[in-house]
Interface confidence: medium
């Protein structure tokens, strides 16, 4: 049926659009960039991204239409809605602060919440983190008693235990919570890298050709026999 199909008879796709046969008498146009509509008859007015503030653009009869996100208005959604123009958003004497696309209440002392509609209780919920205990010190003030290893006005900061570390023999201090660990070089072990690693036990074949392994602090040596020499009696 191809020769009698609308794609060939009426060439419906305009402005360089490509016609695709869907069935005996239906079709679909793939438009060139810059054109839109069932038959590519409209200029794509959305091509220039006219819609602002995250709004959605659609083209209708060569015109663009913007669907604004909440908090914006105008033909191009370019205007921020000033929610603070409408009284009553913030309760208990809260000050309304207009923001792009929204608003925020700055509450007077003693109130909290999005609309300043809740009474502020310093320790409910507790602002103290990392297991800190909240203690109310006044009508609107609190103090956090931190667990060992933490500090900060809300116990948010880990105390670095490394400044006074006792890692020996080139060990590197790694801070923990109210403690630290020593990352030891290969020749040393133990909590503070003070214990010598016995390489002769770890590597039974450290010395070649009948050489005897002798452990030493921070290393080992080979006692070679039968004319062999070198670090591992291989020469």
């Amino acid at each position: 049926y191809s020769t009698s199909h609308p794609c060939f008879v009426s060439r419906p796709c305009l402005n360089g659009g490509t016609c695709h046969m869907l069935s005996r008498d239906t079709y679909e146009c793939t438009c060139q960039v810059g054109f839109t509509g069932k038959e590519c008859q409209w200029t794509d007015a959305c091509l220039s991204h006219p819609c602002a503030n995250g709004s959605t653009c659609t083209t209708v009869a060569n015109q663009f239409s913007c669907k604004c996100l909440t908090g914006f208005t105008g033909q191009k959604c370019e205007t921020d809605v000033n929610e603070c123009d409408i009284p009553g958003h913030c309760q208990h004497g809260g000050t309304c602060l207009n923001l792009p696309g929204s608003y925020q209440c700055q509450c007077p002392q003693g109130f909290t919440g999005q609309y300043c509609d809740s009474l502020y209780v310093p320790c409910a919920p507790s602002p103290c983190v990392n297991g800190g205990t909240c203690r109310q010190t006044g009508d609107f003030t609190f103090e956090c008693n931190c667990l060992p290893g933490f500090e900060g006005s809300t116990c948010e900061r880990n105390i670095d235990d490394c400044p006074n570390h006792r890692c020996q023999n080139g060990g590197v201090c790694v801070d923990g919570v109210n403690t630290y660990n020593c990352r030891c070089p290969p020749q040393w072990t133990g909590q503070f890298c003070t214990e010598d690693v016995d390489e002769c036990l770890l590597q039974p074949n450290a010395c070649q050709n009948g050489g005897t392994c002798a452990n030493r602090n921070g290393g080992y040596g080979c006692v070679c026999v039968n004319g062999w020499s070198g670090d591992d009696c291989s020469e």
């Epitope: 900060g152 900061r157 670095d160 801070d175």
Partner: antibody, heavy 120, light 107 residues
Framework: EVQLVESGGGLVQPGGSLKLSCAVS????????MEWVRQASGKGLEWVAA??????????VYSASVKDRFTISRDDSKSTLYLQMNSLKTEDTAVYYC???????????WGQGTLVTVSS | DIQMTQSPSSVSASVGDRVTITCQTS??????LAWYQQKPGKSPKLLIY???RLQDGVPSRFSGSGSGTDYTLTISSLQPEDFATYYC?????????FGGGTKVEIK
């Protein structure tokens, strides 16, 4: 409204001294950790020193680059934070900001900054 | 000291673009991370604290995520007023350390 206003910056010769002030208002000064942060021209931010709050005995921490040369202090009666800078070096040239540590891993209020230039 | 590696150092973008900035720390900071915006001649402004919590008054197009040693700041739809330099900062332990900054420029 929380406000921090620094002052005391200026031109000083290497080896010289300068004392910066930061007057605060709009919050209970003694409840908060206070920090000094600096920024050399065209460079990033560098933490300098901190003074903990009253609950933590106003104890002090310094960065390695200023330890033994700079002293942070505060006067609660004047709601003012200070940074005494001695033995100044050319690499101390920067805008110095005082900031309030909000207690949630962020510095939530900053002053406008004061410029310190160390040059001969 | 905890090292902060921020990338990219600069990014060119257009209004409406989605912009992502990353920050990597040399050790686990347990979400103790903040993001700041700074415009030329101005002091830094706190955007995000605790890795993902939006500071009061900051538009919701800014968001933060991450844990452990890897953190991200996302601007979902870049606005003209967002062209600035952004810094990450760890507040998990002293000394406080900052990333090197990311300059967001107009394409």
């Amino acid at each position: 409204e929380v406000q921090l206003v620094e002052s005391g910056g200026g031109l000083v010769q290497p080896g010289g001294s300068l004392k910066l002030s930061c007057a605060v208002s709009g919050f209970t000064f003694s409840d908060f950790y206070m920090e000094w942060v600096r920024q050399a021209s065209g460079k990033g931010l560098e933490w300098v020193a901190a003074q903990r709050n009253k609950a933590n005995d106003f104890s002090i921490v310094y960065s390695a680059s200023v330890k033994d040369r700079f002293t942070i202090s505060r006067d609660d009666s004047k709601s003012t934070l200070y940074l005494q800078m001695n033995s100044l070096k050319t690499e101390d040239t920067a805008v110095y900001y005082c900031s309030r540590d909000g207690g949630r891993w962020g510095l939530d209020a900053w002053g406008q900054g004061t410029l310190v230039t160390v040059s001969s | 000291d905890i090292q902060m590696t921020q990338s990219p150092s600069s990014v060119s973008a257009s209004v409406g673009d989605r912009v992502t900035i990353t920050c990597q720390t040399s050790e686990d900071i347990y979400s103790g991370l903040a993001w700041y915006q700074q415009k030329p001649g101005k002091s830094p402004k706190l955007l995000i604290y605790g890795a993902s919590r939006l500071q009061d008054g900051v538009p919701s197009r800014f968001s933060g995520s991450g844990s452990g040693t890897d953190y991200t700041l996302t601007i979902s739809s870049l606005q003209p007023e967002d062209f600035a330099t952004y810094y990450c900062q760890q507040g998990f332990k002293y000394p406080l350390t900052f990333g090197g900054g990311t300059k967001v420029e107009i394409k």
